[in-house]
Interface confidence: low
């Protein structure tokens, strides 16, 4: 028969012959022949290959460098690379998460609109009228001003975006 010019999925062409690729987690040791199957070997410790392949060397797992604020989020297997993320309070500087920076805090007068994650920074928003934040925080939202009326009190000092209202007792008319 005519030698093949293309091979099926999970095969590759070598010496006019279709050989099976090695499955994920394994590397190629020797190509198939007319009489023998492709020979594959599992990747070693701290190595991986994530596709059907004919690689003769496995890839090294990514190193999550603690000096860059990185830690292992998901340990690599023979078929997957290690996934790094940032230590608590830090987030990745890029999608590849090769280094980390500290989450920013929202200043007084600003509240957290979206808490930072391992991959995105804190998003702050100005406290609108009726709300305040008196702390610098990476977690606190703007708090609503206290409602003096519900406590049967009156406003003695107006609130700002940084301070709560101050409530006091109702003025009593002397008899």
């Amino acid at each position: 028969p005519e030698p093949p010019t293309a091979c099926r999925e999970k095969q590759y062409l070598i010496n006019s012959q279709c050989c099976s690729l090695c499955q994920p987690g394994q590397k190629l040791v020797s190509d198939c022949t007319e009489f023998t199957e492709t020979e594959c070997l599992p990747c070693g410790e701290s190595e991986f290959l994530d596709t059907w392949n004919r690689e003769t060397h496995c890839h090294q797992h990514k190193y999550c460098d603690p000096n860059l604020g990185l830690r292992v989020q998901q340990k690599g297997t023979s078929e997957t690379d290690t996934i790094c993320t940032c230590e608590e309070g830090w987030h990745c500087t890029s999608e590849a998460c090769e280094s980390c920076v500290l989450h920013r805090s929202c200043s007084p007068g600003f509240g957290v609109k979206q808490i930072a994650t391992g991959v995105s920074d804190t998003i702050c928003e100005p406290c609108p009228v009726g709300f305040f934040s008196n702390v610098s925080s990476a977690f606190e939202k703007c708090h609503p001003w206290t409602s003096c009326e519900t406590k049967d009190l009156v406003v003695q000092q107006a609130g700002t975006n940084k301070t709560d209202v101050v409530c006091g007792p109702q003025d009593r008319l002397r008899a």
Partner: antibody, heavy 126, light 112 residues
């Protein structure tokens, strides 16, 4: 709503073949890994096979390896289990199940087999 | 393969009383990301299995808070704080750390 519906079960003689289907609806089928799990009459649950969301990775239990093949057609939102050389011990209710996940810190985390079909019965008997 | 062992295999319960099921794995299910890859499923009579708990202690959507999962490594427990009549069925633990997935033998919970 999110739903999985199996079909294709029936009575078949030993050595014959059968193809089970699992039709998915109510979610993005191509985003989820899928499993087949079976339950022999009066017995517990036995895992059969899993396939990755793109169909590139497949694993089968040793008890069915070389006889059963899991596959999927994302354009049809359907999961399949091709069962060849059937044996009496393959008699069971076959369930398909979705491998749930949730997005946390930009990564997908395992969330259990969160959706199951109603099951389809396969009886292998002469 | 990881072997999952449940106890007891049968559990008669009184409605309103607590119940507890144990599941032990032949190797640790604690992964390097800090999660225990263990699920609990309930199969009510004549129904498909349904997910109760994933990753050891996380309640699935819609599962009542009387169900809780605990444990780490190789020893896990499913607790029902106050059993209700609708909780009868067979409870299975399943390890999700490795392929092949493996289930416990099941614990049949029935009303006394």
């Amino acid at each position: 709503q999110v739903q999985l519906v199996e079909s294709g079960g029936g009575v078949v003689q030993p050595g014959r073949s059968l193809r089970l289907s699992c039709a998915a609806s109510g979610f993005t089928f191509s985003s989820y890994g899928m499993h087949w799990v079976r339950q022999a009459p009066g017995k517990g649950l036995e895992w059969v096979a899993v396939i990755s969301k793109d169909g590139g990775n497949k694993y089968h239990a040793d008890s069915v390896k070389g006889r059963f093949t899991i596959s999927r057609d994302n354009s049809k939102n359907t999961l399949y289990l091709q069962m060849n050389s059937l044996r009496a011990e393959d008699t069971a209710v076959y369930y398909c199940a979705r491998r749930g996940h949730q997005l946390v810190l930009g990564y997908y985390y395992y969330n259990g087999l969160d959706v199951w079909g109603q099951g389809t019965t396969v009886t292998v008997s002469s | 393969d990881i072997v999952m062992t449940q106890s007891p295999l049968s559990l008669p319960v009184t409605p309103g009383e607590p119940a507890s099921i144990s599941c032990r794995s032949s190797q640790s299910l604690l992964y390097s990301n800090g999660y225990n890859f263990l699920d609990w499923y309930l199969q009510k009579p004549g129904q498909s299995p349904q997910l109760l708990i994933y990753l050891g202690s996380n309640r699935a959507s819609g599962v009542p808070d009387r169900f809780s999962g605990s444990g780490s490594g190789t020893d896990f427990t499913l607790k029902i704080s106050r059993v209700e009549a609708e909780d009868v069925g067979v409870y299975y633990c399943m390890q999700a750390l490795q392929t092949p997935r493996t289930f416990g033998q099941g614990t049949k919970v029935e009303i006394k």
